[in-house]
Interface confidence: low
């Protein structure tokens, strides 16, 4: 067993580790979500720029100081372009999120164009159709029962929009959606201990060719991709969606990074690599947005004054646009956008942020030198709830995102999408699909707490992402019934 004196020897302060688990006992035993544990660690040493912690038996550096974060994520990005997730890159492992730095460059160059304004405008009508179907479903259900568990309900909406926008699939029935959701959701909700194994023995999963993804999930994406490739005769269809881009890459046969020169650092675009990208788009596109919307609705139920302001804004903008929600009107709704940003401050979904040093690196403003391959962690949740940056952080307050307020804050005090070159490639897509749906909901319903609304909502410990334990229960009251 490695000894836990790594950080002591380097004069880096940190919490006492426990045998085997290091500082992650609660998350390893699934008592607490990893993001919550990281927030607690962040809070233990308020005066430190960096904290030496142990993920299981591996020493890692938790960075608290915002200037240091800026160096890691932006200024010295070249040193930290790798997320440091070491498992087999076969199967679903070569996806855009988990790929090593060089492979990410090769893939990222190709996928960034999917999310240009022009492409998002084209996708908007598909999102719109999904949102209308969703509202029809909620309206029909409302006649029987006004209480909803909104997290799972919203997953059916985001599942349809990502399926339509990325893959050109239409899930006609809620039943189809639920079936697909059950399979895909396994990846997020099934506790896999592969991650802990990697923390104890970095590189072991890769050496043993082990993946962190259940076989049922791999098979789902394999058949999904096979079907779409067959439907489109293996060629781009002119829809300009994610799958068309993938088929273009398939015809090319490879993508190239610039590390060693032309074809030497090319990534062969096999059907396996295609499945990996399909997987990450699906997961990133549906779960993160559904959870964010659910939390936003929860906060609107608990803050009726804020909800009233939003409803007034939605009504005013819709009135000025003949009742239509367009790509531009969504961007126009200033207060809605601020409420969305505040939701992500309180409930940053991807926790913690992780990078790996590709060489020895001196932490700016300190005497600490981290060795090559050291994992560096950042806790958005810790920062977002730090009263140094946000007054009364547990209070939902969209006004924090007034332009002047944002201008006063350090650029690294808000990290829901990461930061720098390797930030969230789909953040504009996520915002668009979320705000469209919230607009539609608020134009038709008022949200109120139900008798089962949990006012002390906990984070689900079993999920890899931040999410509400036990779901979120609220009442949706059709506005025509509200005087």
């Amino acid at each position: 067993m490695r000894t836990f004196n790594y950080w002591k020897k380097r004069n880096v302060r940190g919490p006492e580790p426990v045998v085997f688990f290091g500082n992650l006992k609660d998350s390893a035993l699934r008592k607490k979500n990893m993001g919550v544990v990281m927030e607690e660690l962040y809070n233990m040493f308020p005066e430190e720029k960096v904290i030496g912690i142990y993920r299981m038996t591996s020493p890692c550096l938790l960075v608290r100081d915002l200037d240091v974060i800026k160096h890691i994520m932006i200024k010295d990005f070249e040193v930290f372009s790798d997320r440091g997730v070491e498992f087999s890159k076969e199967g679903l492992g070569s996806n855009l999120f988990h790929a090593d730095g060089e492979t990410w460059r090769a893939l990222g160059n190709r996928f960034t164009p999917i999310f240009t304004s022009g492409k998002l405008k084209n996708m908007f009508y598909l999102m719109h159709e999904g949102a209308d179907n969703f509202i029809d479903h909620v309206s029909a259900e409302c006649e029987k029962n006004q209480e909803f568990e909104v997290h799972s309900l919203l997953q059916t909406y985001t599942m349809s929009t990502i399926a339509a926008c990325a893959f050109g699939i239409s899930y006609d029935s809620i039943g189809d959606k639920v079936k697909a959701l059950d399979i895909v959701d396994k990846i997020i909700s099934e506790p896999s201990y592969a991650i802990e194994l990697d923390m104890m023995y970095p590189g072991l999963l890769s050496k043993l060719n082990l993946s962190i993804f259940p076989t049922v999930v791999k098979n789902f994406f394999k058949s999904l991709v096979d079907n779409i490739v067959a439907q489109r005769n293996g060629k781009p269809s002119g829809r300009n969606d994610f799958m068309d881009l993938i088929l273009e890459l398939r015809q090319l046969g490879e993508v190239t990074s610039n590390k060693y020169g032309s074809s030497a650092s090319s990534l062969e675009i096999t059907d396996e690599v295609i499945c990996a990208q399909a997987f990450v788009f699906y997961i990133a596109g549906y779960e993160t947005s559904a959870t964010t919307m659910a939390y936003m609705i929860y906060q609107l139920a608990l803050n009726p004054d804020i909800q009233n302001k939003l409803i007034a804004e939605v009504d005013e903008v819709l009135k000025a646009n003949d009742g239509k929600v367009t790509y531009d009107t969504v961007k126009e709704m200033k207060y809605l956008n601020k409420a969305f940003d505040e939701t992500l401050r309180m409930y940053s979904i991807v926790e913690p942020l992780q990078r790996k040093a590709t060489r020895d690196y001196k932490i700016p403003g300190t005497d600490v030198v981290i060795e090559k391959d050291t994992i560096v962690l950042i806790s958005p949740r810790g920062i977002h709830y730090d009263p140094k940056y946000y007054d009364n952080p547990k209070q939902f307050n969209p006004d924090r995102f007034d332009a002047e307020e944002v201008g006063k804050r350090h650029p690294c005090a808000y990290l829901p999408f990461g930061l720098g070159q390797r930030n969230c490639i789909g953040m504009r897509f996520g915002r668009l699909q979320s705000l469209l749906c919230i607009t539609k909901i608020l134009s038709k319903f008022r949200i109120e707490p139900s008798k089962n609304t949990d006012r002390n909502l906990q984070v689900e410990p079993h999920r890899g992402l931040i999410g509400p334990k036990g779901g979120i229960r609220v009442n949706a009251i059709p506005r025509k019934l509200v005087s």
Partner: nanobody, 119 residues
């Protein structure tokens, strides 16, 4: 795990030739491409040539084009690097490396073989 063993290095006169071999063993099915790197004293390791097992697609760095030839023998799981018209500037440790599918980074390395070119 893929194990790589280089051989064929040594001391050669300028203008001479050399053939380096790299034998791969272990889970070679996981290897997508093989590359030859070299590292001269005080310099960074550089890729000189790369070949894909599946289709034999080849890459050479500009500095060695025309003088270096990479080839493979799939049946023997061996990759060769033939070096002609050797120059003192070719003196370096030559490493063989393997790259898996799904990544552009070389993740398995041999121990290296020394090539010294005397003038």
């Amino acid at each position: 795990q893929v194990q790589l063993q280089e051989s064929g290095g040594g001391l050669v006169q300028a203008g001479g030739s050399l053939r380096l071999s790299c034998a791969a063993s272990g889970r070679t099915s996981r290897s997508y491409a093989m590359g030859w790197f070299r590292q001269a004293p005080g310099k960074e390791r550089e890729l000189v040539a790369d070949i894909a097992w599946s289709d034999g697609r080849i890459y050479y760095s500009d500095s060695v084009k025309g003088r270096f030839t990479i080839s493979r023998d799939n049946a023997k799981n061996t990759v060769y690097l033939e070096i002609d018209s050797l120059k003192p500037g070719d003196t370096a440790v030559y490493y063989c490396a393997s790259r898996a599918r799904g990544t552009v980074l070389y993740n398995y390395w041999g121990q290296g073989t020394q090539v010294t070119v005397s003038s």
